[in-house]
Interface confidence: low
Amino acid sequence: IVLRPSRVHNSEENTMRALTLKDILNGTFSYKTFFPNWISGQEYLHQSADNNIVLYNIETGQSYTILSNRTMKSVNASNYGLSPDRQFVYLESDYSKLWRYSYTATYYIYDLSNGEFVRGNELPRPIQYLCWSPVGSKLAYVYQNNIYLKQRPGDPPFQITFNGRENKIFNGIPDWVYEEEMLATKYALWWSPNGKFLAYAEFNDTDIPVIAYSYYGDEQYPRTINIPYPKAGAKNPVVRIFIIDTTYPAYVGPQEVPVPAMIASSDYYFSWLTWVTDERVCLQWLKRVQNVSVLSICDFREDWQTWDCPKTQEHIEESRTGWAGGFFVSTPVFSYDAISYYKIFSDKDGYKHIHYIKDTVENAIQITSGKWEAINIFRVTQDSLFYSSNEFEEYPGRRNIYRISIGSYPPSKKCVTCHLRKERCQYYTASFSDYAKYYALVCYGPGIPISTLHDGRTDQEIKILEENKELENALKNIQLPKEEIKKLEVDEITLWYKMILPPQFDRSKKYPLLIQVYGGPCSQSVRSVFAVNWISYLASKEGMVIALVDGRGTAFQGDKLLYAVYRKLGVYEVEDQITAVRKFIEMGFIDEKRIAIWGWSYGGYVSSLALASGTGLFKCGIAVAPVSSWEYYASVYTERFMGLPTKDDNLEHYKNSTVMARAEYFRNVDYLLIHGTADDNVHFQNSAQIAKALVNAQVDFQAMWYSDQNHGLSGLSTNHLYTHMTHFLKQCFSLSD
C-alpha cells in the first residue's frame, strides 16, 4: 500500500488546501527528470537551466560549457546533437510536429573548433530526420523522403535514394503505420557501430488506402489531410531493407538484405534492425498474422559486396497462445562474442523472461525465472547484465533494476534499486554510459521523482541529479489524496487496482466512484508512480474515490492474463472492470448510485462498452477519442490481437465487438462522447459512427468535438476538455459547483 501522507493534523489543517483544477491545468505540480546525454564512459552533456550546453566529467568533477545559450538563441535552437569527434554540433530549430514521433526541423551545423556556423553546402529545409555517424562526423539525413549522406558537414551531399515521394515511397523514415505501431520511432535508418555502413528501410505505400479528413484552419476552404493508413484487413505497406557502404557509397550502391523464405511466403512486416558489428547485422521480421517472428543474423560478404543471411542464423519465435512478444517483439542484446545474444520472451510457464541464445532458440538458456516478468534489458557488459523487472515484493506495477553477474558461474543476481529509497522509489528506469561505467537512475515514484548518478562497478550513489525540491516544497501545504495499490482475487484472476482516496477518507462514509480505464492489450495502469493530475484533483477537492484496474489483457503478469483477450477484444477487459466495481461496492464506502467510468482511446472503447453493458452499475461515463469498431483501426495493431476481419478468420467478433452494436443500452446512462476532428490515429469516424448509431436508436447523449485537434487534444483544448469533463461528472454526482 502506498499511503501518500495527507499531513492533516489539527494544528496544520488551516494552512492546508485541496488541489484545484487550475493547479492541474497550469502544471503547478509537474516534476523534472534528469537523463544524462552520455558521450563517453564518464562524460555527459546536459542543457542547463539557462540553456547552456554543459559537458560534465564524472571522474574529474569538472564541467564546462561547450555551447553557449547565445549561440543556441542565435538560431532559436530547441535541441542539439554533438558529433562523436566533438568537432561539430547540430542545432535544431523550427520544430514542426507531424505524427506521434515524427517532426520536421531546420538544422544548422556549428563548428566548435572555430566557433562559427558551417557555411557552404548548408542543409536543405525542412529536414525529416538527421543524425551523426557513431564515430567521426559523417551526417545522414532525410529530405523529401530521400536519404542523403555527408562525409563532413561542409561537404556536398551524396544522394543515396532517388525514388522518395510524398505519401508513396518513404526512405529512412517510416510511414504512418510503421511509425505508430511497429518501430515507435521517427527514423528508419541505422548506422553500423563504427559508421562504415548505413542500413535503411524503404516503405512502399503506393497501394495503401488513404484516410482523408478536413483540417479547418482559418482559410475559406478547409484543407484535406491524406494519409496512407491501412485499416484492419487492408493492403499493407511493402518494406525492403538496404545497406550502403558510406566510405564508398557510389561503389556498389545500396544492397538489399534478403527476407527469410518462411517470412517472404506471405504478407509480412519488418520489426527492427540491430547492428552487431560493422559487418554483422540482425534483422527481425514478422508474419502479418503476428504469431511468428524470425530473427535473422546477416553477414557482409566482402568478395561479393552483399549481405548473406544463412538459414542457420535464423531464429524463430512463435506463440501458440497469442501473438508474438508483448506489445512489440523484443529486440536482442548481443554479447561480446558478436553471435550469442540475450532476449526476453515467454518461458514454458508463460512469463516473459531473459534467455541467452547461443545457437538455437530451442537450446536457449533461461537467465531469469519466476512468476513475474523481466521487462527491459538495459545493458550487457563483459561481466554484467542490467535489466528491469517487477519481481520485488511481487507488485506487478513496480520496476526495479537488477544486475546479473554473467562473468561468474552460476550467475548471481542482485537488485540494484530495491533498497535505495524504498518508500519513495519503487518504479525505476536507467540510463547507462559506455561500458556501463556509470549510470543514472530515474525514479518515478510513488514518492516525488528523483534522479541519481551511480558508479557502474559498485552501484554506489555518486550524486543526486534532480530531486524536485521545489515540487516538494510546493506540495507541503497541499492535501494530496491517499493512494493504495492492492489486488482482488476473482475466479483465479488477480485484478490489481490503484485506489485514490480523498484526504480525509473515512471508511464509514459513502463516496462517489470514478473508474479510470485504459485496458488495452499489454498496457498497465496500476503502477507505483507519482502523479498529481486530474484524478488527484477529483479526489482532493471533489471528494471522489478514483480506481484504476488492470484486468485481463494487461501486461507483466504472465501470458495467461495477457493473451486472455486474444481474438476477443472488448469482452474480458470490460468484464473485469465491472467485476472490480462490484467488489469495490462490497467494501462499503462506495455510493452505488454514483458510479462513473471514463477512458481515452482504448479506454474510451472500454468505458463505452462498460456503460452499454446493461449492468445498471454506472450512472454516467465519458469516452474520449474512442475506437468504436476494430475495422476502423490500424492493421498492424488490430490484427496483432484480433486476426483478420474476414469470414474465414474473425469477422464475426469484429462485428460483435463494436460500440454501435450496443447503442440501445446507452438509454439508461449519461454518456459524454468527445473526439478531435483531426485525429490521425483513432479517426473521428469512430465517434461519428457512435453518434449516428445513438441518434438512429433515439438515445440522448452529450458530445464535444475539438476542431483540428489530434488524438492528444493538446494546448487550450486540454483546459477546455478537463473543465468540461469536470462539470459533467459533478453534475452526474450531484456535487455543487
Epitope: E394, S412, C415, H419
Partner: antibody, heavy 117, light 108 residues
C-alpha cells in the same frame, strides 16, 4: 505495528518432530518473503529457511530434506515443520519478515527448541 | 557460499567512545550487506541495510560504510544501551544468507 510471535518450541528427542508457528500482525504475510533464523546457545545467527511471497521455498543445506517451511495466508501465520531432529538443531528459532529477498527488517522474540535424549 | 568474518571478536570500550566494527566478505558483495544488533535475551534488530542506509528509527550515531569485501559499522559515541553483540549479514548471493560470527561490544 508489525509483530511476530513464535510458538511450538520445546524439548524433543533426537529423531522426533516439532512444528513451529509464527503469527504475524500489522502486515499481510502473503505479500512478503518470510524467513526462519536460528541461534544455538552462546553461538551466532544461522539462516535456516525462507519462503517467498510467491510460495517458493529455500533451505540451508543442514536442514534440507528434514525441514519444511509453509504458511497459511488466511491465518497470517508462518510454519516450520521439523522432522528427524538432531542434537545440533538445538537453538532459539526466530521468524523474521524479509525485505524483498534481502535483509530481515522485523524479528520475533524466538522460541527455544531443545533436542536431547 | 560467502563467508563473512567479523573483527574484533570483542571490543571493550567506555560510554562516549567511538566503536569501529569490521566485517570482511570472502568475495565481493557490492553493498549487499546488513548490520544487526542483539542484546542478551532479545531478538536481533536491523540497524543498517545496503551497507550504509540506517533502518527506520535507528539513531544517527550508527553509520555503515564500505563496499566490495570490506565493511565497517561505526558507533560515533557509545551510549549505555549500545553494549551488545553486532552481526553483519550478506544478501548478495543466496541461498544461503550468511551472517558473520559477531562482535561483542562490552563495557570496559
Amino acid at each position: 505495528d508489525v509483530q511476530l510471535v513464535e510458538s511450538g518450541g520445546g524439548l524433543v528427542q533426537p529423531g522426533g518432530s516439532l512444528r513451529l508457528s509464527c503469527a504475524a500482525s500489522g502486515f499481510s504475510m502473503s505479500n512478503f518473503a518470510m524467513t526462519w533464523v536460528r541461534q544455538a546457545p552462546g553461538e551466532g545467527l544461522e539462516w535456516v529457511s525462507g519462503i517467498r511471497g510467491s510460495g517458493t521455498t529455500y533451505y540451508a543445506e543442514s536442514v534440507k530434506g528434514r525441514f519444511t517451511v509453509s504458511r497459511d495466508n488466511s491465518k497470517n501465520t508462518l510454519y516450520l515443520q521439523m522432522n528427524s531432529l538432531r542434537a545440533e538443531d538445538t537453538a532459539i528459532y526466530y521468524c523474521a519478515k524479509t525485505w524483498g529477498t534481502e535483509y530481515f527488517d522485523y524479528w520475533g522474540l524466538g522460541t527455544l527448541v531443545t533436542v536431547s535424549s | 557460499e560467502i563467508v563473512l568474518t567479523q573483527s574484533p571478536g570483542t571490543l571493550s570500550l567506555s560510554p562516549g567512545e567511538r566503536a569501529t566494527l569490521s566485517c570482511r566478505a570472502s568475495q565481493p558483495i557490492s553493498s549487499y550487506l546488513a548490520w544487526y544488533q542483539q542484546k542478551p535475551g532479545q531478538a536481533p534488530r536491523l540497524l543498517i541495510f545496503s551497507a550504509s542506509n540506517r533502518a527506520t528509527g535507528i539513531p544517527d550515531r550508527f553509520s555503515g560504510s564500505g563496499s566490495g569485501t570490506e565493511f565497517t559499522l561505526t558507533i560515533s559515541s557509545l551510549e549505555p544501551e549500545d553494549f551488545a553483540v553486532y552481526y553483519c549479514q550478506q544478501y548478495y548471493d543466496w541461498p544461503p544468507y550468511t551472517f558473520g560470527g559477531g562482535t561483542k561490544v562490552e563495557i570496559k
